[in-house]
Interface confidence: medium
């Protein structure tokens, strides 16, 4: 028994010599058809949903998953180089919005609110949603009407 | 294996402009985002900016915001590197490098385009 | 200006090890990989580790890479004389929303 656990214990580090538990030990895995970027897991839904029903999926989803936040340009721009390889077009719900409906967004994941992406006129009216706009590649957001019916992103930490 | 051929040796007066130019042989950039950094006599490498192939965006380090353009024609598979307001210290090696994604490493380089400027 | 820092030389015989090192801050190598490069002046430079340990098919396994919070390292083991070149540390830094060299270390095989 102890030469079996030992043989194991030998195999496993030399499969992290060669690099092949490298990626595993840093890299967790995301659910199937996710994406990993910087210790999250995305995922990109191309179903029709209002904002606080896409919420409600992501959640479905487990592993504390949410509408997803994005806190930094390499993260916006990684996520929107990889949407874009499947469509350029349709805008795409994300994690922030205006609960109190007083211009004070939030991240529905608990994050800071310090990153900014807007694109220019992107306030005002009934738009308390926000949304990745297809009109710069994905890369800047625009608030919307929360009730309308569009894509979504879903992210949570392995 | 993709090879990146880079245009020829360059020499600029102060205040003049110059466009570089990266070619994917062997390869195509459609998935890949090419990176430009250059390299003073004397010093280290610098990095400049990026364009993502597939989206056309760029990204620029903020040293070099406003002053440089990166632009790409994916009917050619050519990436351009446009310096404006040349100073003497632009006199350098200017190399493209490949990423499979963006900000990811740089696996494949160019052999570089040396820039003089001089009056 | 880098925010990498690496010594500007180092130096070992035929067979001996020699360890570059790379430090950086929270905003780089505290918070993403490295990668280093072998720059021989007059060529292209070359990848010999990306995300701070992987090595690329092709690079011998003389050449290992380690982080440890805000700074790496690259270890040539076995070095020889076709090891003379600079070494590059680089890693994306958040704070600058782009990538950073280090000011690059000059490998000389006595």
């Known amino acids: 028994m102890a030469s079996r656990s030992m043989r194991l214990l030998l195999l496993l580090s030399c499969l992290a010599k060669t690099g092949v538990l490298g990626d595993i030990i840093m890299r967790p895995s995301c659910a199937p058809g996710w994406f990993y970027h910087k210790s999250n897991c995305y995922g990109y839904f191309r179903k029709l949903r209002n904002w606080s029903d896409a919420e409600l999926e992501c959640q479905s989803y487990g592993n504390g998953a949410h509408l997803a936040s994005i806190l930094s340009l390499k993260e916006a721009s990684t996520i929107a180089e990889y949407i874009s390889g499947y469509q350029r077009s349709q805008p795409i719900w994300i994690g922030l919005h205006d609960p109190q409906k007083r211009q004070q967004w939030q991240w529905i994941d608990g994050a800071m609110y310090l990153y900014r992406s807007w694109s220019g006129k992107s306030m005002g009216g009934n738009k308390h949603c926000a949304e990745m706009s297809s009109n710069n590649n994905f890369l800047t957001w625009s608030s919307n009407e929360c009730n309308k019916r569009q894509h979504f992103l879903c992210k949570y930490r392995p | 294996q993709m090879q990146l051929v880079q245009s020829g040796a360059e020499v600029k007066k102060p205040g003049s402009s110059v466009k570089v130019s990266c070619k994917a042989s062997?390869?195509?950039?459609?998935?890949?985002?090419i990176n430009w950094v250059r390299q003073a006599p004397g010093q280290g490498l610098e990095w400049m900016g990026v364009?993502?192939?597939?989206?056309?965006?760029?990204y620029y380090a903020q040293s070099f915001q406003g002053r440089v353009t990166i632009s790409a024609d994916k009917s050619t598979g050519t990436v351009y590197l446009d310096v404006s307001s040349l100073r003497s210290d632009d006199s350098a090696t200017y190399y493209c490098?490949?990423?499979?994604?963006?900000?990811?490493?740089?696996?494949?380089w160019g052999k570089g385009t040396l820039v003089t400027v001089s009056s | 200006q880098s925010v990498l820092t690496q010594p500007p030389s180092a130096s070992g015989a035929p067979g001996q090890r020699v360890v570059i090192s790379c430090s950086g801050s929270?905003?780089?190598?505290?918070?993403?990989?490295v990668n280093w490069y072998k720059h021989v002046p007059g060529e292209a430079p070359k990848l010999l580790i990306y995300?701070?340990?992987q090595r690329p098919s092709g690079v011998p396994g003389r050449f290992s890479g380690s982080t440890s919070g805000t700074s790496g390292s690259l270890t040539i083991s076995g070095l020889q004389s076709g090891d003379e070149a600079d070494y590059y540390c680089?890693?994306?830094?958040?704070?600058?929303?782009?990538?950073?060299f280090g000011t690059g270390t000059k490998l000389t095989v006595l």
């Open positions: 995300s701070s340990t």
């Open positions: 062997g390869g195509t950039f459609s998935s890949s985002s």
């Open positions: 680089a890693a994306f830094d958040d704070s600058l929303n782009g990538f950073v």
């Open positions: 490098a490949r990423a499979r994604r963006l900000w990811q490493t740089f696996d494949i």
């Open positions: 364009i993502i192939s597939n989206l056309g965006t760029p």
């Open positions: 929270t905003s780089s190598i505290g918070s993403n990989t």
